[in-house]
């Protein structure tokens, strides 16, 4: 690849559009670039209404390799023609483009969560943002996975209304004095690869019975 020319093939960049905490985040990585850009500018237009490319204000001359497009990309039906420009000082190093269709290209990152273990149950507190744009609701199911001693159980809590505010789910009928691990993720359709959260684990405290059994020994 000649670095004088800014017209790299689109394979120079790898893009990913993710729903992170119900925000549309476009991130990118550069492939085989020996000159690292000092900054980037992101531009886009809508395919059904092609106009001049519009600069994304909060992603103009940015040093970050991601851009929050929640307030720009409001439709899951439209295709957004996206151009990423990479600069070193005043020199344009490259330009990559790609079309995004949120309904099919979006990946869904797991929400933040906390767990608290009790004798025979675990409280799972899932943190959703207080307000979620209607356009970014998608058709998502929350899945909570419980793992213990090699056995995995899936819980699909029914969430009334949309996924906003904090949500608590109780995994009950658990065995005291046992280690349990929990992972959460958002499922869009059966066919889409899911991104599971890292496991959070807790050793449940011993119950009354096991305590009396221990003292009897």
């Amino acid at each position: 690849i000649s670095y004088d020319s800014p017209d790299y093939t689109d394979e120079s960049c790898t893009f990913k559009i993710s729903l992170r905490n119900f925000r549309s985040i476009l991130s990118w990585e550069l492939k085989n670039h020996s000159i690292v850009p000092t900054h980037y500018t992101l531009l886009y237009t809508i395919m059904s209404k092609p106009e001049d490319l519009k600069v994304v204000k909060n992603c103009a001359n940015t040093t970050r390799s991601f851009c929050d497009l929640t307030d720009e990309w409001r439709s899951t039906h439209e295709a957004y023609v996206t151009v990423l420009e990479g600069f070193s000082g005043n020199t344009t190093l490259f330009s990559c483009s790609h079309n995004f269709w949120l309904a099919i290209d979006m990946s869904f990152e797991p929400p933040e969560f906390e767990i608290v273990g009790f004798t025979n149950h675990i409280n799972v507190m899932v943190k959703f943002p207080s307000i979620v744009e209607e356009e970014l609701q998608f058709d998502l199911s929350l899945v909570i996975e419980e793992q213990s001693e090699g056995i995995v159980k899936k819980h699909k809590p029914e969430i009334k209304g949309n996924m906003s505010g904090n949500f608590t789910y109780i995994i009950d009928k658990l065995i005291p004095n046992t280690n349990y691990c929990v992972s959460v993720y958002l499922e869009h359709s059966d066919e889409q690869a899911v991104i599971k959260s890292p496991l959070k684990c807790t050793l449940l405290p011993p119950g009354q019975e096991s305590e009396s059994a221990e003292s009897a020994k």
Epitope: F15, M47, S48, S75, H77, A79, N99, I104, D105, E191
Partner: antibody
Framework: QVQLQQSGPELVRPGVSVKISCKGS????????IHWVRQSHAQSLEWIGV????????NYNQKFKGKATMTVDKSSSTAYMELARLTSEDSAIYYC??????????WGQGTSVTVSS | DVVMTQTPLTLSVTIGQPASISCKSS???????????LNWLLQRPGQSPKRLIY???KLDSGVPDRFTGSGSGTDFTLKISRVEAEDLGVYYC?????????FGGGTKLEIK
């Protein structure tokens, strides 16, 4: 110019599987999703599903889950659809079509699948 | 699933005369983004489908302006101001708002 070139007609026995292909040319293949649509005499046009050629994400019509499997090979700009456990009811013309968003703007020429013993 | 109902099933028209096809959806195709995701296509005999109209009324490039699309919400119409011989075939409406995408049953335009 934009072209979606589909594989040739298939005559297959009941119970077997068939894999049909759709090769895109004249545009950046990974900028457009590929959809599959079935046309049979009984059912007019039926949308089978869509695959994101860049992300690999798929969305199937529930009716075709377990029947159709969509895949994509970016290196050859080709999308594939495998149809499993074929019966006479699967005899139809299968079209691929591309979309960037909500509308199918170019269609392949169709692949005829005939299931007969 | 969204049901798309087209009428009539068959339309016999004299060349030079107007034609009109109706399409009704069981759910609104108007999205929160303000757009309505209703499309029309034509399948000429022995050919693959070809898109004519998208977003209710936008004509595809190369489509003559004798074709017009109109409607909103759940009721849509495709009109041909003066039918020509090349217009014969089967017309389908389809929606791209709700998965699974669904098609109307088709309207066959015949030349009298």
């Amino acid at each position: 110019q934009v072209q979606l070139q589909q594989s040739g007609p298939e005559l297959v026995r009941p119970g077997v599987s068939v894999k049909i292909s759709c090769k895109g040319s004249g545009y950046t293949f990974t900028d457009y999703a590929i959809h599959w649509v079935r046309q049979s005499h009984a059912q007019s046009l039926e949308w089978i599903g869509v695959i994101g050629t860049y992300s690999g994400n798929r969305n199937y019509n529930q009716k075709f889950k377990g029947k159709a499997t969509m895949t994509v090979d970016k290196s050859s700009s080709t999308a594939y659809m495998e149809l499993a456990r074929l019966t006479s009811e699967d005899s139809a013309i299968y079209y691929c079509a591309r979309s960037a968003g909500y509308s199918l703007d170019f269609w392949g020429q169709g692949t005829s699948v005939t299931v007969s013993s | 699933d969204v049901v798309m109902t087209q009428t009539p099933l068959t339309l016999s028209v004299t060349i030079g005369q107007p034609a009109s096809i109706s399409c009704k959806s069981s759910q609104s195709l108007l999205d929160s983004d303000g757009k309505t995701y209703l499309n029309w296509l034509l399948q000429r005999p022995g050919q693959s489908p070809k898109r004519l109209i998208y977003l209710v009324s936008k004509l595809d490039s190369g489509v003559p302006d004798r074709f017009t699309g109109s409607g909103s919400g759940t009721d849509f119409t495709l009109k041909i101001s003066r039918v020509e011989a090349e217009d014969l075939g089967v017309y389908y409406c389809w929606q791209g708002k709700h998965f699974p995408w669904t098609f109307g049953g088709g309207t066959k335009l015949e030349i009298k």
